[in-house]
Structure formats: structure tokens, C-alpha cells
């Protein structure tokens, strides 16, 4: 951009430099050169002379017009034609910005991963603004009145550090830009309730050899948290529903998880956990993939009836891809395993 | 109640530097977030640089380059050094709590006075 010009005269512009998107824009060129009374202003952007939509104003001053400017930036110069000159003389030159306001931020969320020390606030940003836009985050605390404030762009951590005077805040996000200001709805957040167990891991898989064949999942979290509340979804690599088994887990030990599964077939495993009672999921761990063992006695398989699914699990629920184009996206065909809870954002989906 | 007390300005050459301080009291400084704002002479206020919470700074584009904010959280106190200063920096300096947009910055305090001048 043309960041330092020295200028033989002035350019400015109608709205102003940054305006929105879509509207109409007049640039004015004004000169001010020493023995030069030009013949022609001429109008340039990015670069390229403009041809159309200027007017001579005066001897000195000429006007571009654009009709609904849309472009996020360009670069804007003029120069004149003096008389006995073989090159046109430079005048002045601008930067020049379109975009929108900020959207209200939206789907404000606040999570503790634990161990991390940090309180991680996400946010939906909206729309595209294409100009520099400020996000503040600001936090509350209900207890101390007092109010701490961050800049940001799409997410900011906050050191539990700063969090120690009390349980209780109040948090919101404030998008700031040239065109315009709004503020997220704001959420309440009690720091006990928003912690995210340490990540779970699936650590192996092995089939017995029995007549029906089990295979045991072996899975870990090195969470401190005492009562935590646990899925575990699971399907062929060739299919695209996945069923979700719950567990109550205690994790001063390694959990082993019982499957009576389909003989010889890839299998994919995932485990996901909260605190009991708690509104936020970790998000899936890795896929664990296991291949079961092949069938030694003939019988009927019949994968929706039972053995298929071991007898002490609580809930087993099935979950379905959208569609073959859109594996990431899952739906959940069962809301009992999200307890009353919304399934929010934490869908690492494998298809 | 909150308290702010600028220090530091006076009378400068066009090239040379200045240090203002800003002493706070009243409240919780480490962890709130500040401003530098300044008022030029027939002019409104104009911000020049801000610090949030977590450390994270912010500059005008008219000082990006010339001014440095700090924050000594053991002492209460918020810094503007400034270098390069330009004739076009003379101004009243205030120091603020909160971020410099969107109304989000509250308090300020009486204002150091700077000039530059050859």
C-alpha cells in the first residue's frame, strides 16, 4: 500500500478511507504543483489508469466515482499531465478499505482443560469483516466487581492465575472495528463447573479367543477429577453408523471396556469424557483402530441383537453420518446419552 | 477509589525521547488492562496505546514503531516511553483503565503535558 507518499497536492475520500462495503465512493484528487497547470488529472487503482466515471471539477480538483465499491482494498493515486513534461507527475496517493461491522460474537463458551492453567473463551466471529477488527474479551468477577479485559481474535486464554480472587465471572466479547461495535450475550461462569478432564486415551484392544469372541478396550486418563462420565463410540471402518456405549469411570486404574463385536472386521474406537454432571465434553480422542480375530465356529451373525453389545453397558446408542460427502458431521439419532446435554462443538468426527 | 497520576512530560526536541509514568491505585492493576490516550491542542482525545490483561500491547499507527507501553505490576505503574518524537506528538497524555475502543476504557487521570519543539 502507499503507507509514505509525499504529496504535490491532497486525495481524500468520500465517506472516508474505510467505509462499507457496497456503497457508492467519490476520491478526489486536488493538485498543488509548481509550474504545472496540468492538462489532465488521471486516476489510478492498484496500479491501473481508471477511464471512466471522472470529472474535472475545477483546474486543479478532479472526481472518480465509483458505483457499489466492493473490493476489500485497493490503492488509490492520481497524477497530473503537465504541459512539456514526457512522464506524469505524481500528486498523491491513499489506501482505501471496504468491509462490514462486526457480527454480534456468538456461541461464546469458556472451558478449563485441566492442567492447563489457562481458561480457554471461544467465539463465532460471524461474517467476514475484511477490516481490522478488534475482539476484547471482558471478565467480571461477580464477587469483586472488578473487570479484566483481553484482545483477541477468534479465542483467548486466560491464566487461572488471574482468576484467583474469585469462583464466579461474568464474561462477554466486544467486536470493535471502524464501522461499527457489538457486544456477545454474556455468560455466566463458575470456574468449578467448566473443567475438562485431562485427555483420555485408548492405550490397546485384544480379542479373546473364547467361543464368543470379547474384545476388551484399554483406555486411561490421568484426570484427578473423581466422578467422571465417559462415551465410547465404536463402528466398522466401512460403516457409517457408530454406536456409543456410557460408562461411569474411575480412572485410579486402567477402565476395560467388554465388546462382543463382529468376527474379522476393522473396528474403530474413540472415548470422550466430563466431569459428572458437567456441561463440557473433552473432544473425542484419537480413533483406536482393532482388528477382531476371525470367526472359528459357523453360526448367524446377527450385529443388532444381543451379544453383540456386552450386557453391563448403560446405554447403547447409535449415531449416523449425514451423509457420504459429509463424514464430519454426525447426528445424533439417541439423545440419551447426552443426558440432557447439548452436543456442543466437540464433534472430531471420523466418517 | 481508583486513582491515576501521570508523570513525565515536558519540553523536547523533535528527535529526542520521553518517559511518562503512570501511578494507579484503587484497584487491582496486575490484572487490569490500560490505556494511553492524548489530547492535541483544538483536538479530541485520540488513543495511542493499550495494554489488556494478559500483556498483550497495541499501538496506534501514528506511534507504531516510536512508543513502547509496560506495565510493573510490582509497583503499580504503567510506562509510555517514547523515542522519534514528532512535532505533531505535542499533546495533554493520559493514562486510562480498560482497552482503548469501544467505550471500554473508564477512568483517567489529570494528564501530563507534552511538546515537541525545535
Known amino acids: 500500500g502507499i503507507t509514505s507518499i509525499n504529496c504535490s497536492g491532497d486525495m481524500w475520500v468520500e465517506p472516508g478511507e474505510i467505509f462499507q462495503m457496497g456503497m457508492n465512493v467519490s476520491i478526489y484528487c486536488q493538485e498543488a504543483l509548481k509550474h504545472c497547470r496540468p492538462r489532465n488529472l488521471y486516476f489510478y487503482k492498484n496500479g491501473f489508469k481508471e477511464e471512466f466515471d471522472i470529472t474535472r471539477i475545477n483546474r486543479t480538483t478532479a472526481r472518480i466515482w465509483y458505483k457499489g465499491f466492493s473490493e476489500p482494498h485497493a490503492y488509490m493515486h492520481c497524477t497530473a499531465e503537465c504541459p512539456g513534461h514526457f512522464q506524469e507527475t505524481l500528486i498523491c496517493g491513499k489506501d482505501i478499505s471496504s468491509g462490514h461491522p462486526p457480527d454480534a460474537p456468538s456461541n461464546l463458551t469458556c472451558v478449563i482443560y485441566e492442567y492447563s492453567g489457562n481458561m480457554t473463551c471461544t467465539w463465532n466471529t460471524g461474517k467476514p469483516t475484511y477490516i481490522d477488527t478488534k475482539y476484547i474479551v471482558h471478565v467480571k468477577s461477580l464477587e469483586t466487581e472488578e473487570e479484566q479485559q483481553y484482545l483477541a481474535s477468534s479465542y483467548v486464554k486466560i491464566s487461572t492465575d488471574s482468576l484467583q480472587g474469585s469462583r464466579k465471572y461474568l464474561v462477554w466479547v466486544q467486536a470493535v472495528n471502524s464501522l461499527g461495535m457489538e457486544n456477545s450475550q454474556q455468560l455466566h461462569v463458575h470456574l468449578d463447573d467448566i473443567v475438562i478432564p485431562s485427555a483420555s486415551i485408548i492405550s490397546r484392544a485384544e480379542t479373546t479367543n473364547d467361543t464368543v469372541p470379547k474384545t476388551i478396550v484399554y483406555w486411561k486418563s490421568k484426570t484427578m477429577i473423581e466422578k467422571v462420565f465417559c462415551e465410547m463410540r465404536y463402528k466398522t471402518t466401512t460403516n457409517q453408523t457408530w454406536s456409543v456405549k456410557e460408562f461411569d469411570a474411575n480412572f485410579t486404574y486402567v477402565q476395560q471396556s467388554e465388546f462382543y463385536l463382529e468376527p474379522d472386521s476393522k473396528y474403530v474406537f474413540q472415548v470422550r469424557c466430563q466431569e459428572t454432571g458437567k456441561r463440557n465434553w473433552q473432544p473425542w480422542s484419537s480413533p483406536f483402530v482393532h482388528q477382531t480375530s476371525q470367526e472359528t465356529g459357523k453360526r448367524n451373525w446377527q450385529p443388532w441383537s444381543s451379544p453383540f453389545v456386552h450386557q453391563t453397558s448403560q446405554t447403547v446408542s447409535q449415531v449416523t453420518a449425514k451423509s457420504s460427502h459429509e463424514p464430519q458431521k454426525m447426528e445424533m439419532l439417541s439423545a440419551t446419552i447426552f443426558r440432557g446435554h447439548p452436543a456442543s462443538g466437540n464433534h472430531q468426527d471420523i466418517g | 477509589q481508583v486513582q491515576l497520576q501521570e508523570s513525565g512530560g515536558g519540553l523536547v526536541q523533535p528527535g529526542g525521547s520521553l518517559r511518562l509514568t503512570c501511578a494507579a491505585s484503587?484497584?487491582?492493576?496486575?490484572?487490569?488492562?490500560m490505556t494511553w490516550v492524548r489530547q492535541a491542542p483544538g483536538k479530541g482525545l485520540d488513543w495511542v496505546s493499550g495494554?489488556?490483561?494478559?500483556?498483550?500491547?497495541v499501538y496506534a499507527d501514528s506511534v507504531k514503531g516510536r512508543f513502547t507501553i509496560s506495565k510493573d505490576n510490582a509497583k503499580n505503574t504503567l510506562y509510555l516511553q517514547m523515542n522519534s518524537l514528532k512535532t505533531e506528538d505535542t499533546a495533554v497524555y493520559y493514562c486510562?483503565?480498560?482497552?482503548?475502543?469501544?467505550?471500554?476504557?473508564?477512568?483517567r487521570g489529570q494528564g501530563t503535558q507534552v511538546t515537541v519543539s525545535s
Open positions: 486510562a483503565t480498560g482497552l482503548p475502543w469501544g467505550n471500554t476504557w473508564r477512568t
Open positions: 484503587g484497584f487491582t492493576f496486575s490484572t487490569s488492562a
Open positions: 495494554i489488556d490483561s494478559g500483556g498483550t500491547t
